[in-house]
Interface confidence: low
Amino acid sequence: RKAVLDCEAMKTNEFPSPCLDSKTKVVMKGQNVSMFCSHKNKSLQITYSLFRRKTHLGTQDGKGEPAIFNLSITEAHESGPYKCKAQVTSCSKYSRDFSFTIVDPVTSPVLNIMVIQTETDRHITLHCLSVNGSLPINYTFFENHVAISPAISKYDREPAEFNLTKKNPGEEEEYRCEAKNRLPNYATYSHPVTMPSTGGDSCPFCLK
C-alpha cells in the first residue's frame, strides 16, 4: 500500500512525463540516429524503455543523464511513432510520440546547357534535374564556383531553369548546379560543364 501511495504522490510534480527527442528529425533510409529520453528528475534512478508503436526496442538505466538509444532507420515503418517510458519502481510515465520524417536523398543532378549565340552575346539557358530524391528540391546554379541564381524550388520532377545573357567571353566559364532537399547537410552537385571561350567555332552547345 505504501508503494502505491508513494507512486501516487510521485505522479504529481516529482515524476512528470519524460521527454523523447532526437537531434535529427529528418532522415534518409539507412541513417543512424540517436534518440534521447530524458527526465526532469535528476536524483532518481530511472529505467528508460523505448518503444516503436507497441514493440519494445530497448531499456537503459539512467540517473541525471538522458538515456541514448542508437537506431538505424532502414525501413519506412521505422519512422515511428516512438515513445519512451520512464519507470521508477512501480511508477511509470510515457513521453509524447516522436516520429522521424524519412526523406530520400537527392542524387547528383544533371546539368544541361543550351546557348543561342549572337555576334555580341550568348543567351544561356541552364537546366538542372535530380531524378531521385524527395520533393521539393531546391536547385542553385553556379558559374566558376559562385552562385548566380537564387534557390529555385521544384515541387515536381521537372528541371529547374535559369537564363542569363553574357557578352561573348574571352575565357572559359564553368557551370554546375546544386540540388538539395530537406535532408540537413546533404547537397549534391552536377558535373561541371565548361563553356569554351569565343574563338572560332568553339561553342558546342550553341544554336546559331
Epitope: 534518409m28 542524387t107 547528383s108 531524378v131 552536377s190
Partner: antibody, heavy 121, light 110 residues
C-alpha cells in the same frame, strides 16, 4: 532477371593493356553505381573502384593512375581499362552492382561471373 | 580501413553452430556486409547493414555488431554452407568512396 556478364579477359604480357567489359541486363545501368572487384588465385577479394551514376569515379589507392572505370549507358555496359599490367594483377575480375538502396548502403547485391586476367610473359 | 577476419579457416560438422568475426581498423557504424563464396563462383550477399538478412537467405544466418566488431553466425551448419565467407565495409558519399573486404574465412568439413 538482373544479369552482369564480364568479358575481355585473357593472357597479356607485363606492361601491356587490357579493357574489360561488363554488360548489364534486366535493369537500367544509368540508375546504378557500379564497381569492379578482383580476386587473385586463392586470395582475398580486393575492391578496385566505383563509378557513380554521373560518372564520378573512385579508386583504391593502388589502382589510381593505372586503372580507369567508364560506362556507356546506351550500351548498358561498364568498362575497366587496365594499363601497365604486372604479374600481380593476375586475378579474376568481377563487376558488381551497388544495391538499389541509398547512398550509405553500398553493398553489392549483384555480381557478374568474373573474367580471368593472366599477366605473364 | 582494414578489415580483419578470424579465423582464416575452420572445420566443422553439419549441425554445428559456427561463428566468424570481423574487426574494422576504425569505427564503421553498421556499414558492413557479409558474403558467401563457393569455388569458381561469384560472391553472394548474405547480410547487409551488419544484421539485415538479404532476401532469400536462410534464417540460420545472422549478423551482429556495430562500430568495429562484427560477427556472422550460422546457427546450424548445412552441407551447402561449406564455403568461404567475407566481410566488407562500405562507405560512399559525394566526396569519398571506399570498400574494403576481409580476407575470408574458409569453412570446411571436419
Amino acid at each position: 532477371e538482373v544479369q552482369l556478364v564480364e568479358s575481355g579477359g585473357g593472357l597479356v604480357q607485363p606492361g601491356g593493356s587490357l579493357r574489360l567489359s561488363c554488360a548489364a541486363s534486366g535493369f537500367s545501368l544509368s540508375s546504378h553505381a557500379m564497381s569492379w572487384v578482383r580476386q587473385a588465385p586463392g586470395k582475398c577479394l580486393e575492391w578496385i573502384g566505383t563509378i557513380s551514376t554521373i560518372d564520378t569515379t573512385y579508386y583504391a589507392s593502388w589502382a589510381k593512375g593505372r586503372f580507369t572505370i567508364s560506362r556507356d549507358n546506351s550500351k548498358n555496359t561498364v568498362y575497366l581499362q587496365m594499363n601497365s599490367l604486372r604479374a600481380e594483377d593476375t586475378a579474376v575480375y568481377y563487376c558488381a552492382r551497388l544495391s538499389e538502396l541509398y547512398t550509405t548502403n553500398s553493398y553489392y547485391s549483384r555480381w557478374g561471373q568474373g573474367t580471368l586476367v593472366t599477366v605473364s610473359s | 580501413i582494414q578489415m580483419t577476419q578470424s579465423p582464416s579457416s575452420l572445420s566443422a560438422s553439419v549441425g554445428d553452430r559456427v561463428t566468424i568475426t570481423c574487426q574494422a581498423s576504425e569505427s564503421i557504424g553498421s556499414l558492413l556486409a557479409w558474403y558467401q563464396q563457393k569455388p569458381g563462383k561469384a560472391p553472394k550477399l548474405l547480410i547487409y547493414r551488419a544484421s539485415t538478412l538479404e532476401s532469400g537467405v536462410p534464417s540460420r544466418f545472422s549478423g551482429s555488431g556495430s562500430g568495429t566488431d562484427f560477427t556472422l553466425t550460422i546457427s546450424s551448419l548445412q552441407p551447402e554452407d561449406f564455403a568461404t565467407y567475407y566481410c566488407q565495409s562500405y562507405h560512399y558519399s559525394s566526396s569519398s568512396s571506399y570498400a574494403a573486404f576481409g580476407c575470408g574465412t574458409k569453412v570446411t568439413v571436419l
